[in-house]
């Protein structure tokens, strides 16, 4: 019996037409959302003028329903057994589970100001970068609507670049209309052990952005993994919001609508530095921010966008260390609420739950040259905001579940 | 087309004033910022003054700093270099350059002051 | 200050000739550094910046190398146009400053 419902599971989590996991993962049957809190400052002229602790306020949820779309492109590949494709990206607001709306405002870190002032460290350019920031009435802090801080807005300081510059800043911008990719992974119809993993993104094994084994394309991107999944494992996935591929390890049972699931969660080791954890090295990229590579819990992902200062963390600077967290007021990080974790049906390796988490920081310096910077006496890694990305099998796709799969078995 | 053009040039005395102009053309100079330039005869270049964009502010050579002013007029899309107390040394060609991130990619045609008595 | 410091102060070659002139910085410019031309009796003519970037219009034969304190100008073949006198300039910290100048010669 358990040699047939073995033979079931391997066909039907190949990767190709026909298949239960074919046809949800061209499009998750899975209703995904996406929540964002924003860091309000509230103290924006201390810390300009005194180099004062940030106070921060979390405002939210503004949530977004995400990944309705379907992947595209899909191409199967006979000869090296793989499927390759683009995710597109698609947000919509939903009202209805937010506090507020899109045109709710917050005071943030100027992002085009602390990224020209990091991406031009040279002493004549700053001194440029001041006359247009003075210009345009920029600040260090600056004013916007959620629209504008996720999606985009014409920053009034880069417009006076007399060159063709992109004026536009977002955080996430561009999104809409965008796809993520391309991914190539493999089908599994020659090894059912390999179906899902990554073997090449945009067209490469590594990312370019990391030394060494940081630099890989590990396993596949969270959605499945291969069958069988064992509670010893360690299940590698890569996230392109992050940059980078990165890990889970079993934590707990959980059960997931009568589904018997194992819940894999980011454990801190992941996110820890060098010294306490030596693998880690190579996402260590500069030696003054991370004080010789002696702080964690941040990841620089300055390579990964264009040279922009941005670093990932977990929300509210869970699993990092004092350092970071010191100069920000108003922050409370609790496992329950900050960490990943991922509830995984382990005979077919499907995610059935999810939430991902994750914190967008920008760094801004001291600057000499740039008034709206020179009263700065230390480097901020300034939280923007943190956002909460869950998806939960439906009720009627869990009871086809429990009786086509786990009931069998059971 | 860009282009820039340098007046003001000529003989003067030890002690001297002279103002030089820039005229600028197929851009706006307030966007950009505008640098002088000179060359003494037959030695190298000498940056002297800038104006940052949107007039922000002027920066000087440690040579003509309290002597030279520069200055912008946008009405009338010109530049000029106010110098007084000139010496000797400061014969040279003048020429006003435009730039953006330091590097000058269009020069006027130069116009020679001569300080001598 | 930061001084630029270029060699050789001329030399001579012939057309067809790979020329090579380089630039010392005092101190690290990372790549903020550019390249002129200039003819007697005209005005400069940018044919390099950042180092490496060609200008619009310049000729391919002419590249440009380096970052932090050494630069190179290369020009592969050189042409009957291009003899005259070659300064490279820093462009990282005010007050700008340039190279004394390279005159090449026709041997």
């Known amino acids: 019996g358990d040699l047939l419902i073995q033979k079931t599971i391997k066909k039907q989590v190949v990767l190709e037409e026909g298949t239960i996991a074919f046809k949800n993962w061209v499009k998750t049957g899975t209703e995904v959302y996406r929540q964002f809190w924003i860091f309000d400052v509230q103290n924006p002229q201390e810390v300009m003028m005194n180099s004062s602790n940030i106070q921060v306020k979390q405002r939210g949820p503004y949530t977004y329903r995400v990944r309705f779309l379907a992947k595209e492109n899909v191409t199967q590949d006979a000869e090296d057994n793989t499927v390759s494709f683009l995710q597109p990206n698609g947000a919509i607001f939903e009202p209805s589970l937010s506090v507020g709306t899109e045109a709710d405002n917050f005071t943030v870190l100027n992002l085009a100001v602390a990224a020209a002032s990091h991406i031009y460290q040279n002493q004549f350019v700053q001194m440029i970068l001041n006359s247009l920031i003075n210009k345009s009435k920029s600040s260090m802090f600056q004013v916007r609507t959620l629209r504008e801080l996720l999606w985009g807005y014409r920053d009034p300081f880069l417009s006076l670049v007399p060159y063709p510059v992109t004026t536009t800043v977002g955080l996430f911008y561009p999104y809409n209309n965008t796809a993520d990719g391309v991914y190539k992974v493999f089908n599994g119809k020659d090894n059912i052990s390999k179906v899902a993993i990554i073997d090449t993104y945009k067209g490469k094994r590594n990312l370019s952005y990391w030394e060494s084994h940081c630099d890989m394309i590990n396993g596949t991107d969270a959605a499945s993994f291969p069958p069988f999944v064992e509670k010893s494992q360690v299940l590698q996935f890569f996230s392109s919001d992050i940059c980078r591929s990165i890990y889970a390890v079993f934590e707990s049972d959980v059960n997931l609508k009568g589904i018997p699931v194992y819940r894999f969660v980011l454990p801190s080791k992941a996110f820890a530095s060098p010294v306490e954890n030596p693998d880690n090295y190579c996402f260590c990229t500069e030696k003054i921010i991370s004080k010789n590579c002696t702080s964690y819990g941040v990841l620089d992902i300055s390579k990964c966008k264009e040279g922009r200062p941005v670093y990932i963390s977990l929300p509210h600077f869970l699993y990092a260390s004092p350092d970071v967290s010191e100069p920000i007021d108003g922050l409370n990080p609790n496992e329950e609420e900050h960490r990943t974790y991922l509830d995984i049906e382990p005979i077919t390796g499907f995610t059935l739950q999810f939430a991902k988490r994750l914190q967008v920081n920008l760094l801004v310096k001291p600057s000499e040259k740039i008034q709206v910077l020179k009263n700065l006496k230390r480097n901020y890694i300034v939280p923007i905001l943190w956002l909460n990305e869950t998806g939960t099998i439906g009720d009627e796709k869990a009871n086809m579940f429990r009786s086509q799969v786990t009931g069998k078995i059971n | 087309e860009v282009q820039l053009v340098e007046s003001g040039g000529g003989l003067v005395q030890p002690g001297g004033s002279l103002r030089l102009s820039c005229a600028a053309s197929?851009?706006?100079?307030?966007?950009?910022?505008i640098h002088w330039v000179r060359q003494a005869p037959g030695k190298g270049l000498e940056w002297v003054a800038w104006i940052a964009p949107y007039g922000g502010e002027e920066y000087y050579a440690d040579s003509v700093k309290g002597r030279f002013t520069i200055s912008a007029d946008t009405s009338k899309n010109t530049a000029y270099l106010q110098m007084n107390s000139l010496r000797a040394e400061d014969t040279a060609v003048y020429y006003c350059?435009?730039?953006?991130?330091?590097?000058?990619?269009?020069w006027g045609q130069g116009t020679l002051v001569t300080v001598s008595s | 200050d930061i001084q630029m410091t270029q060699s050789p102060s001329s030399l001579s070659a012939s057309v067809g000739d790979r020329v090579t002139i380089t630039c010392r910085a005092s101190q690290d410019v990372s790549n903020w550094v550019a390249w002129y031309q200039q003819k007697p009796g005209k005005a400069p003519k940018l044919l390099i910046s950042?180092?490496?970037s060609l200008y619009s219009g310049v000729p391919s034969r002419f590249s440009g190398s380096g970052s932090g304190t050494d630069f190179t100008l290369t020009i592969s073949s050189l042409q009957p146009e291009d003899f005259a006198t070659y300064y490279c300039q820093q462009h990282s910290n005010a007050p700008l400053t340039f190279g004394q100048g390279t005159k090449v010669e026709i041997k």
């Open positions: 197929g851009f706006t100079i307030s966007s950009f910022g």
């Open positions: 350059a435009r730039s953006f991130f330091g590097y000058f990619d269009y």
């Open positions: 950042y180092a490496t």
